[in-house]
Interface confidence: medium
């Protein structure tokens, strides 16, 4: 199958908001944990027929491996469950979500695994180079979104310790050949390119050699241009609030957008006793919008001071870019101060939003 179909790769971890579209998620689990991967469709609707794949092979459901169209669970995980997982559309093999899973013997800090493949004393007197971790070199085709970091690895050994060099499309590859340069980590047998761009596409070959021989491995890199999308608003924000009369309230709205977003805070109002106009559009008043001196960070917070009963109602965070609009709403309930004091006597605390 062609890995060229791997565009708009999205990672989602179960129970937590996933990263922005375009990211491959790196997940670390402890041995014995349950690995849970979730791949919800964009927009929340049903997804087309999917298959879950690990290191290029379709996963077969079992008592330990629970497979659903939008969710994968691997119970009692072990080191062998580490690898590259993807959720793919069945017919086209298009990758919808992609995860890199590492299962460690102990709970991990999530540090990078550099250093694992340093040259080691193999006990061999003399010998030609050989791959020490061939299972880590299976993924010969790599499709990543632009702006991601790519690392190619060719962990090897031999005696004397071999040298490693890199070619791009069959020619010597050096840092000056790309904007942003490259990182050659000889002790980790790796080539690292940060913030990849479409011109980084090509075939990358590691050449490992000593006086007894030479081995090489070629990887193909495809850099996928980001699909534009309307702003993404963090789930659960803004949150409903309950406040005491006269207190201060803050609503928060977290906006993710490739294109420059325009953020507005709206309050829903009634006109002649109606909340919506003849066309079904809600009546709103703009409370906060971008001005000459406002930053995006400032716009992500709506502050209400000394709230009155008139401030109660529905508030909406509206974010738009050149692609479209997204909005999330929340309600503010304003309670009279004396009711709050009664609650305080009964519950032993005052909840003021």
């Amino acid at each position: 199958e062609s890995l060229g179909t791997e565009q708009r790769v999205v990672g989602r971890a179960a129970e937590v908001p996933g990263p922005e579209p375009g990211q491959q998620e790196q997940l670390v689990f402890g041995s014995g944990d349950a690995v849970e991967l979730s791949c919800p469709p964009p927009g929340g609707g049903p997804m087309g027929p999917t298959v879950w794949v690990k290191d290029g092979t379709g996963l077969v459901p079992s008592e330990r491996v629970l497979v659903g169209p939008q969710r994968l669970q691997v119970l009692n995980a072990s080191h062998e469950d580490s690898g590259a997982y993807s959720c793919r559309q069945r017919l086209t093999q298009r990758v919808l979500c992609h995860f890199s899973v590492r299962v460690t013997d102990a709970p991990s800090s999530g540090d990078d695994e550099d250093g694992e493949d340093e040259a080691e004393d193999t006990g061999v007197d003399t010998g030609a180079p050989y791959w020490t971790r061939p299972e880590r070199m299976d993924k010969k085709l790599l499709a990543v979104p632009a702006a991601n970091t790519v690392r190619f690895r060719c962990p090897a050994a031999g005696n004397p310790t071999p040298s490693i060099s890199w070619l791009k499309n069959g020619r010597e590859f050096r840092g000056e050949h790309r904007i942003g340069g490259i990182k050659l980590r000889h002790q980790q047998w790796s080539l690292v390119m940060e913030s990849v761009v479409p011109s980084d596409r090509g075939n990358y070959t590691c050449v490992v050699e000593n006086k007894f021989g030479s081995i090489r491995q070629t990887y193909t890199l495809d850099v996928l241009e980001r699909s534009p999308h309307r702003p993404i608003l963090q789930a659960g924000l803004p949150a409903n609030q309950t406040a005491v009369l006269g207190s201060d309230v803050e609503f928060h709205c977290k906006v993710y957008s490739d294109a420059q977003p325009h953020i507005q805070w709206l309050k829903h109002v009634e006109v002649n006793g109606s909340k919506v106009g003849p066309d079904g559009t809600p009546y709103v008043t703009v409370l906060k919008t971008a001005g000459a001196n406002t930053t995006d960070k400032e716009l992500e917070v709506l502050s209400l001071h000394n709230v009155t009963f008139e401030d109660a109602g529905e508030y909406t965070c509206l974010a738009g870019n050149s692609i479209g609009f997204s909005h999330h709403s929340a309600w503010l309930v304003v309670l009279p101060a004396e009711e709050e004091l009664v609650e305080a006597d009964e519950a032993g605390s005052v909840y003021a939003g």
Epitope: M47, P49, L91, E225, P228
Partner: antibody, heavy 119, light 108 residues
Framework: EVQLVQSGAEVKKPGESLKISCKGS????????IAWVRQMPGKGLEWMGI????????RYSPSFQGQVTMSADKSIRIAYLQWSSLKASDTAMYYC????????????WGQGTLVTVSS | EIVLTQSPGTLSLSPGERATLSCRAS???????LAWYQQKPGQAPRLLIY???SRATGIPDRFSGSGSGTDFTLTISRLEPEDFAVYYC?????????FGQGTKVEIK
């Protein structure tokens, strides 16, 4: 606004070759599959195959494998459907359609290209 | 391949009436991977429903889809003049993707 605009109607003789086109705009053309669907006169819809303009990966319906060729030029945002030797039975309306994000249903359609093959 | 059979072939109704269109699959359509399209004379099809019951963007709520397995239904609660057209179901759960032969909804 997502739009798929197809080339104009064609009248051909049996044995002739033909290439019709579908130009996408208003979205990331290289990031969505394009399908081709045939509708013979007075009949229903038949799925022919799909192409991913990002790398020209193609998948054909078994009924159309070897009968037509799908291609794409991402630099000009156009997908193509071509025949090397037309038959009278190829007379039909041909639609291109964009597949949704998950590559399943057809969310936007072109206006169709009528191909008439007659001696 | 999965064969989709739509019934009735033609449905004659008046504006304001309720239309119920059926789509039956020759074998189970996994996870309700079924879509409905509307096609008017001289026009391209238009997506109405996907995932058996999810309305596509901009589709009025008088259109609803239901069903699972082998039996699926498209319901138009109150027919408007612009709803008279041909309706096709399509499954995308198994390759090759297939369409039903269509149901024509005509004015009585």
């Amino acid at each position: 606004e997502v739009q798929l605009v197809q080339s104009g109607a064609e009248v051909k003789k049996p044995g002739e070759s033909l290439k019709i086109s579908c130009k996408g705009s208003g979205y990331s053309f290289t990031s969505y599959w394009i399908a081709w669907v045939r509708q013979m006169p007075g009949k229903g819809l038949e799925w022919m195959g799909i192409i991913y303009p990002g790398d020209s990966d193609t998948r054909y319906s078994p009924s159309f494998q070897g009968q037509v060729t799908m291609s794409a030029d991402k630099s000009i945002r156009i997908a193509y459907l071509q025949w090397s030797s037309l038959k009278a039975s190829d007379t039909a309306m041909y639609y291109c359609a964009r597949l949704d994000y998950s590559g399943s249903w057809f969310d936007y359609w072109g206006q169709g290209t009528l191909v008439t093959v007659s001696s | 391949e999965i064969v989709l059979t739509q019934s009735p072939g033609t449905l004659s109704l008046s504006p304001g009436e309720r239309a119920t269109l059926s789509c039956r699959a020759s074998q189970s359509v996994s996870s309700s991977y079924l879509a409905w399209y509307q096609q008017k004379p001289g026009q391209a099809p238009r997506l109405l429903i996907y995932g058996a019951s999810s309305r596509a963007t901009g589709i009025p709520d008088r259109f609803s889809g239901s069903g699972s397995g082998t039996d699926f239904t498209l319901t138009i609660s109150r027919l408007e003049p612009e709803d008279f057209a041909v309706y096709y179901c399509q499954q995308y759960g198994s390759s090759p993707w297939t369409f039903g032969q269509g149901t024509k909804v005509e004015i009585k």
